[in-house]
Protein backbone atom coordinates (compact mmCIF):
# COMPACT_ATOMS: atom_id res chain seq x y z
CA UNK A 1 0.00 0.00 0.00
CA UNK A 2 1.39 3.39 -0.89
CA UNK A 3 0.30 6.99 -0.57
CA UNK A 4 1.76 9.15 -3.36
CA UNK A 5 5.39 7.97 -3.26
CA UNK A 6 5.28 6.53 0.26
CA UNK A 7 4.74 2.98 1.43
CA UNK A 8 2.31 2.99 4.36
CA UNK A 9 2.36 -0.75 5.11
CA UNK A 10 3.93 -3.94 3.86
CA UNK A 11 2.52 -6.64 1.59
CA UNK A 12 1.52 -9.87 3.32
CA UNK A 13 2.42 -11.88 0.22
CA UNK A 14 5.67 -13.42 -0.97
CA UNK A 15 6.70 -12.55 -4.52
CA UNK A 16 8.86 -14.64 -6.83
CA UNK A 17 12.00 -13.04 -8.30
CA UNK A 18 10.67 -13.83 -11.80
CA UNK A 19 7.87 -11.35 -11.14
CA UNK A 20 10.19 -8.48 -10.27
CA UNK A 21 12.05 -6.18 -12.63
CA UNK A 22 13.62 -3.84 -10.11
CA UNK A 23 13.33 -2.16 -6.75
CA UNK A 24 13.75 1.14 -4.97
CA UNK A 25 14.38 1.72 -1.29
CA UNK A 26 12.33 3.99 0.90
CA UNK A 27 13.98 5.40 3.99
CA UNK A 28 11.86 6.58 6.89
CA UNK A 29 11.89 10.39 7.12
CA UNK A 30 9.53 13.28 7.75
CA UNK A 31 7.63 12.41 4.54
CA UNK A 32 7.52 8.61 4.79
CA UNK A 33 6.90 6.78 8.07
CA UNK A 34 8.58 3.42 7.40
CA UNK A 35 11.62 1.85 5.79
CA UNK A 36 10.54 -0.21 2.80
CA UNK A 37 11.70 -1.96 -0.33
CA UNK A 38 9.45 -1.09 -3.24
CA UNK A 39 9.44 -3.94 -5.76
CA UNK A 40 8.50 -3.08 -9.35
CA UNK A 41 6.72 -5.99 -11.00
CA UNK A 42 6.34 -7.09 -14.60
CA UNK A 43 2.70 -6.03 -14.40
CA UNK A 44 3.73 -2.46 -13.64
CA UNK A 45 2.70 -2.67 -9.99
CA UNK A 46 4.70 -1.30 -7.08
CA UNK A 47 4.70 -3.57 -4.05
CA UNK A 48 5.83 -2.41 -0.62
CA UNK A 49 7.87 -5.01 1.25
CA UNK A 50 9.51 -5.24 4.65
CA UNK A 51 13.30 -4.89 4.24
CA UNK A 52 13.84 -6.96 7.41
CA UNK A 53 12.18 -10.06 6.01
CA UNK A 54 14.44 -12.77 4.64
CA UNK A 55 12.55 -13.27 1.39
CA UNK A 56 12.84 -9.54 0.66
CA UNK A 57 16.59 -9.51 1.41
CA UNK A 58 17.09 -12.50 -0.89
CA UNK A 59 15.42 -10.80 -3.84
CA UNK A 60 17.25 -7.53 -3.21
CA UNK A 61 20.54 -9.45 -3.10
CA UNK A 62 19.69 -11.30 -6.31
CA UNK A 63 18.68 -8.12 -8.15
CA UNK A 64 21.72 -6.22 -6.87
CA UNK A 65 24.01 -8.97 -8.22
CA UNK A 66 22.29 -8.68 -11.61
CA UNK A 67 22.73 -4.89 -11.66
CA UNK A 68 26.41 -5.16 -10.67
CA UNK A 69 27.04 -7.60 -13.56
CA UNK A 70 25.69 -5.12 -16.12
Amino acid sequence: ASNFDCCLRYTDRILHPKFIVGFTQQLANETCDINAVIFHTKKGLSVCANPKQTWVKLIVRRLSKKINKM
Epitope: R13, I14, L15, H16, K18, F19, Q53, W55, L58
Partner: antibody, heavy 120, light 107 residues
Framework: QVQLVQSGAEVKKPGASVKVSCKAS????????MHWVRQAPGQGLEWMGV????????TYAQKFQGRVTMTVDTSTSTVYMELSSLRSEDTAVYYC?????????????WGQGTLVTVSS | DIQMTQSPSSLSASVGDRVTITCRAS??????LNWYQQKPGKAPKLLIY???NLADGVPSRFSGSGSGRQYSLTISSLQPEDFATYYC?????????FGGGTKLEIK
Protein backbone atom coordinates in the same frame (compact mmCIF):
# COMPACT_ATOMS: atom_id res chain seq x y z
CA GLN B 1 19.84 -36.84 4.56
CA VAL B 2 16.90 -34.44 4.74
CA GLN B 3 14.03 -35.69 6.86
CA LEU B 4 10.75 -34.14 7.97
CA VAL B 5 9.03 -36.18 10.67
CA GLN B 6 5.48 -35.26 11.62
CA SER B 7 3.47 -36.02 14.75
CA GLY B 8 0.91 -38.81 14.84
CA ALA B 9 -2.74 -39.00 13.81
CA GLU B 10 -5.31 -36.99 15.78
CA VAL B 11 -9.05 -37.31 16.34
CA LYS B 12 -10.79 -34.09 17.38
CA LYS B 13 -14.30 -32.89 18.08
CA PRO B 14 -15.84 -29.99 16.11
CA GLY B 15 -14.87 -26.65 17.64
CA ALA B 16 -11.62 -27.98 19.08
CA SER B 17 -8.04 -27.14 18.01
CA VAL B 18 -5.24 -29.35 16.74
CA LYS B 19 -1.49 -28.74 16.79
CA VAL B 20 0.66 -30.73 14.36
CA SER B 21 4.45 -30.76 14.60
CA CYS B 22 7.10 -31.24 11.95
CA LYS B 23 10.67 -31.95 13.04
CA ALA B 24 13.38 -31.27 10.48
CA SER B 25 16.83 -32.82 10.27
CA UNK B 26 19.68 -33.21 7.77
CA UNK B 27 19.95 -29.57 6.70
CA UNK B 28 20.36 -26.04 8.06
CA UNK B 29 16.88 -25.46 9.43
CA UNK B 30 16.81 -21.65 9.17
CA UNK B 31 17.88 -21.61 5.50
CA UNK B 32 14.59 -22.95 4.16
CA UNK B 33 10.91 -22.13 4.50
CA MET B 34 8.35 -24.60 5.78
CA HIS B 35 4.99 -24.87 4.07
CA TRP B 36 1.83 -26.60 5.23
CA VAL B 37 -0.37 -28.30 2.64
CA ARG B 38 -3.47 -30.34 3.33
CA GLN B 39 -5.38 -32.99 1.41
CA ALA B 40 -8.96 -33.97 2.21
CA PRO B 41 -9.90 -37.62 1.52
CA GLY B 42 -9.98 -38.24 -2.23
CA GLN B 43 -9.27 -34.55 -2.96
CA GLY B 44 -6.39 -32.47 -4.29
CA LEU B 45 -3.65 -30.50 -2.56
CA GLU B 46 -4.44 -27.24 -0.78
CA TRP B 47 -1.74 -24.77 0.29
CA MET B 48 -2.36 -23.40 3.79
CA GLY B 49 0.59 -21.15 4.44
CA VAL B 50 4.31 -20.84 5.02
CA UNK B 51 6.70 -19.88 7.80
CA UNK B 52 10.28 -18.68 7.48
CA UNK B 53 12.21 -20.19 10.42
CA UNK B 54 14.92 -17.53 10.15
CA UNK B 55 12.61 -14.70 11.20
CA UNK B 56 9.26 -16.42 12.00
CA UNK B 57 7.59 -14.51 9.14
CA UNK B 58 4.32 -16.18 8.17
CA THR B 59 1.81 -15.76 5.40
CA TYR B 60 -1.42 -17.75 5.24
CA ALA B 61 -4.01 -18.53 2.59
CA GLN B 62 -7.02 -16.24 3.04
CA LYS B 63 -9.25 -19.25 3.69
CA PHE B 64 -7.35 -20.09 6.88
CA GLN B 65 -6.64 -16.56 8.09
CA GLY B 66 -7.66 -16.21 11.73
CA ARG B 67 -7.86 -19.98 12.27
CA VAL B 68 -4.31 -21.09 11.56
CA THR B 69 -1.12 -20.30 13.44
CA MET B 70 2.32 -21.47 12.36
CA THR B 71 5.18 -21.27 14.83
CA VAL B 72 8.79 -22.40 14.99
CA ASP B 73 11.17 -23.67 17.66
CA THR B 74 14.68 -23.25 16.26
CA SER B 75 16.24 -24.99 19.28
CA THR B 76 14.61 -28.29 18.21
CA SER B 77 14.28 -27.53 14.44
CA THR B 78 10.55 -28.01 14.74
CA VAL B 79 7.67 -26.20 13.07
CA TYR B 80 4.11 -26.29 14.39
CA MET B 81 0.78 -25.73 12.69
CA GLU B 82 -2.24 -25.11 14.87
CA LEU B 83 -5.73 -25.04 13.39
CA SER B 84 -8.61 -23.89 15.58
CA SER B 85 -12.42 -23.99 15.43
CA LEU B 86 -12.25 -27.34 13.68
CA ARG B 87 -15.13 -28.52 11.52
CA SER B 88 -15.78 -31.79 9.69
CA GLU B 89 -14.42 -30.29 6.43
CA ASP B 90 -11.01 -29.99 8.12
CA THR B 91 -10.67 -33.78 8.11
CA ALA B 92 -7.56 -34.24 5.99
CA VAL B 93 -3.96 -35.33 5.84
CA TYR B 94 -1.74 -32.37 6.76
CA TYR B 95 1.76 -32.22 5.26
CA CYS B 96 4.72 -30.04 6.07
CA UNK B 97 7.04 -29.43 3.13
CA UNK B 98 10.39 -27.70 2.88
CA UNK B 99 10.36 -24.61 0.67
CA UNK B 100 13.56 -24.20 -1.28
CA UNK B 101 14.05 -20.81 -2.94
CA UNK B 102 17.17 -22.24 -4.59
CA UNK B 103 14.97 -24.51 -6.70
CA UNK B 104 12.39 -22.00 -7.84
CA UNK B 105 10.53 -21.81 -4.53
CA UNK B 106 9.57 -25.47 -4.87
CA UNK B 107 8.65 -27.85 -2.05
CA UNK B 108 11.49 -30.29 -2.39
CA UNK B 109 11.03 -32.49 0.71
CA TRP B 110 7.79 -33.51 2.38
CA GLY B 111 6.81 -34.97 5.73
CA GLN B 112 4.95 -38.28 5.87
CA GLY B 113 1.65 -36.54 6.62
CA THR B 114 -0.58 -36.36 9.69
CA LEU B 115 -4.19 -37.49 9.48
CA VAL B 116 -6.52 -35.21 11.41
CA THR B 117 -10.08 -36.52 11.77
CA VAL B 118 -12.79 -34.16 12.97
CA SER B 119 -15.82 -36.04 14.19
CA SER B 120 -18.45 -35.68 16.87
CA ASP C 1 -5.62 -15.38 -6.27
CA ILE C 2 -4.16 -17.18 -9.28
CA GLN C 3 -6.27 -20.16 -10.40
CA MET C 4 -4.61 -23.25 -11.86
CA THR C 5 -6.63 -25.48 -14.19
CA GLN C 6 -5.28 -28.91 -15.08
CA SER C 7 -6.42 -31.09 -17.94
CA PRO C 8 -7.36 -33.79 -18.29
CA SER C 9 -8.54 -34.63 -14.77
CA SER C 10 -7.93 -38.30 -15.52
CA LEU C 11 -6.13 -40.18 -18.25
CA SER C 12 -5.79 -43.85 -19.19
CA ALA C 13 -2.60 -44.91 -20.93
CA SER C 14 -0.37 -47.92 -21.48
CA VAL C 15 3.23 -48.65 -20.58
CA GLY C 16 5.46 -47.13 -23.28
CA ASP C 17 2.97 -44.40 -24.22
CA ARG C 18 3.89 -40.73 -24.49
CA VAL C 19 1.63 -38.66 -22.26
CA THR C 20 1.16 -34.90 -21.86
CA ILE C 21 -0.66 -33.15 -19.02
CA THR C 22 -1.45 -29.46 -19.28
CA CYS C 23 -1.87 -26.72 -16.72
CA ARG C 24 -3.34 -23.30 -17.41
CA ALA C 25 -2.95 -20.33 -15.06
CA SER C 26 -5.58 -17.61 -14.78
CA UNK C 27 -2.84 -15.07 -15.51
CA UNK C 28 0.78 -14.94 -16.63
CA UNK C 29 2.97 -16.68 -14.02
CA UNK C 30 6.28 -16.11 -15.84
CA UNK C 31 7.48 -19.72 -15.53
CA UNK C 32 7.05 -19.82 -11.74
CA LEU C 33 5.48 -23.26 -11.88
CA ASN C 34 6.31 -26.61 -10.30
CA TRP C 35 5.06 -30.15 -10.92
CA TYR C 36 4.57 -32.89 -8.31
CA GLN C 37 3.79 -36.59 -8.44
CA GLN C 38 1.73 -38.31 -5.76
CA LYS C 39 1.10 -42.01 -5.28
CA PRO C 40 -1.79 -43.31 -3.12
CA GLY C 41 -1.11 -43.02 0.60
CA LYS C 42 2.19 -41.19 0.02
CA ALA C 43 3.38 -37.60 0.22
CA PRO C 44 3.82 -35.67 -3.04
CA LYS C 45 7.24 -35.68 -4.69
CA LEU C 46 8.80 -32.78 -6.60
CA LEU C 47 9.33 -33.58 -10.31
CA ILE C 48 9.88 -30.28 -12.13
CA TYR C 49 10.66 -26.79 -10.84
CA UNK C 50 10.73 -23.48 -12.68
CA UNK C 51 8.51 -25.00 -15.40
CA UNK C 52 11.37 -26.84 -17.14
CA ASN C 53 13.99 -28.01 -14.63
CA LEU C 54 14.17 -31.64 -13.55
CA ALA C 55 14.41 -32.16 -9.79
CA ASP C 56 17.23 -34.31 -8.40
CA GLY C 57 16.77 -38.02 -9.01
CA VAL C 58 13.87 -37.63 -11.43
CA PRO C 59 14.20 -39.78 -14.59
CA SER C 60 14.85 -37.95 -17.86
CA ARG C 61 11.64 -39.31 -19.41
CA PHE C 62 9.89 -36.51 -17.52
CA SER C 63 10.05 -33.03 -19.01
CA GLY C 64 8.32 -29.70 -18.48
CA SER C 65 7.63 -26.90 -20.90
CA GLY C 66 5.57 -23.77 -21.30
CA SER C 67 5.48 -20.07 -20.52
CA GLY C 68 3.00 -17.32 -19.80
CA ARG C 69 -0.26 -18.98 -18.79
CA GLN C 70 0.15 -22.41 -20.43
CA TYR C 71 2.40 -25.24 -19.15
CA SER C 72 2.76 -28.94 -19.75
CA LEU C 73 4.33 -32.03 -18.24
CA THR C 74 5.35 -34.79 -20.65
CA ILE C 75 6.32 -38.38 -19.91
CA SER C 76 8.06 -39.67 -23.03
CA SER C 77 7.63 -43.39 -22.37
CA LEU C 78 5.38 -44.41 -19.50
CA GLN C 79 6.79 -46.85 -16.96
CA PRO C 80 4.67 -48.89 -14.50
CA GLU C 81 5.84 -46.69 -11.59
CA ASP C 82 4.56 -43.54 -13.32
CA PHE C 83 0.90 -44.34 -12.71
CA ALA C 84 0.02 -41.72 -10.11
CA THR C 85 -1.64 -38.32 -9.71
CA TYR C 86 0.18 -35.22 -10.96
CA TYR C 87 -0.24 -31.66 -9.71
CA CYS C 88 0.98 -28.32 -10.99
CA UNK C 89 1.57 -25.42 -8.61
CA UNK C 90 1.86 -21.66 -9.01
CA UNK C 91 4.69 -20.08 -6.97
CA UNK C 92 4.66 -16.60 -8.52
CA UNK C 93 2.88 -15.08 -5.56
CA UNK C 94 1.26 -16.43 -2.42
CA UNK C 95 -1.16 -18.15 -2.05
CA UNK C 96 0.70 -20.92 -3.87
CA UNK C 97 -2.29 -22.52 -5.57
CA PHE C 98 -2.30 -26.08 -6.95
CA GLY C 99 -4.08 -27.44 -9.99
CA GLY C 100 -6.86 -29.95 -9.37
CA GLY C 101 -4.65 -32.89 -10.30
CA THR C 102 -4.48 -35.40 -13.15
CA LYS C 103 -4.91 -39.06 -12.30
CA LEU C 104 -2.90 -41.24 -14.65
CA GLU C 105 -4.29 -44.78 -14.78
CA ILE C 106 -3.32 -47.99 -16.57
CA LYS C 107 -5.39 -48.70 -19.68
Amino acid sequence: QVQLVQSGAEVKKPGASVKVSCKASGYTFTNYWMHWVRQAPGQGLEWMGVIDPSDSYTTYAQKFQGRVTMTVDTSTSTVYMELSSLRSEDTAVYYCARGNYGVDYAMDYWGQGTLVTVSS
Amino acid sequence: DIQMTQSPSSLSASVGDRVTITCRASENIYGALNWYQQKPGKAPKLLIYGATNLADGVPSRFSGSGSGRQYSLTISSLQPEDFATYYCQNVLITPYTFGGGTKLEIK
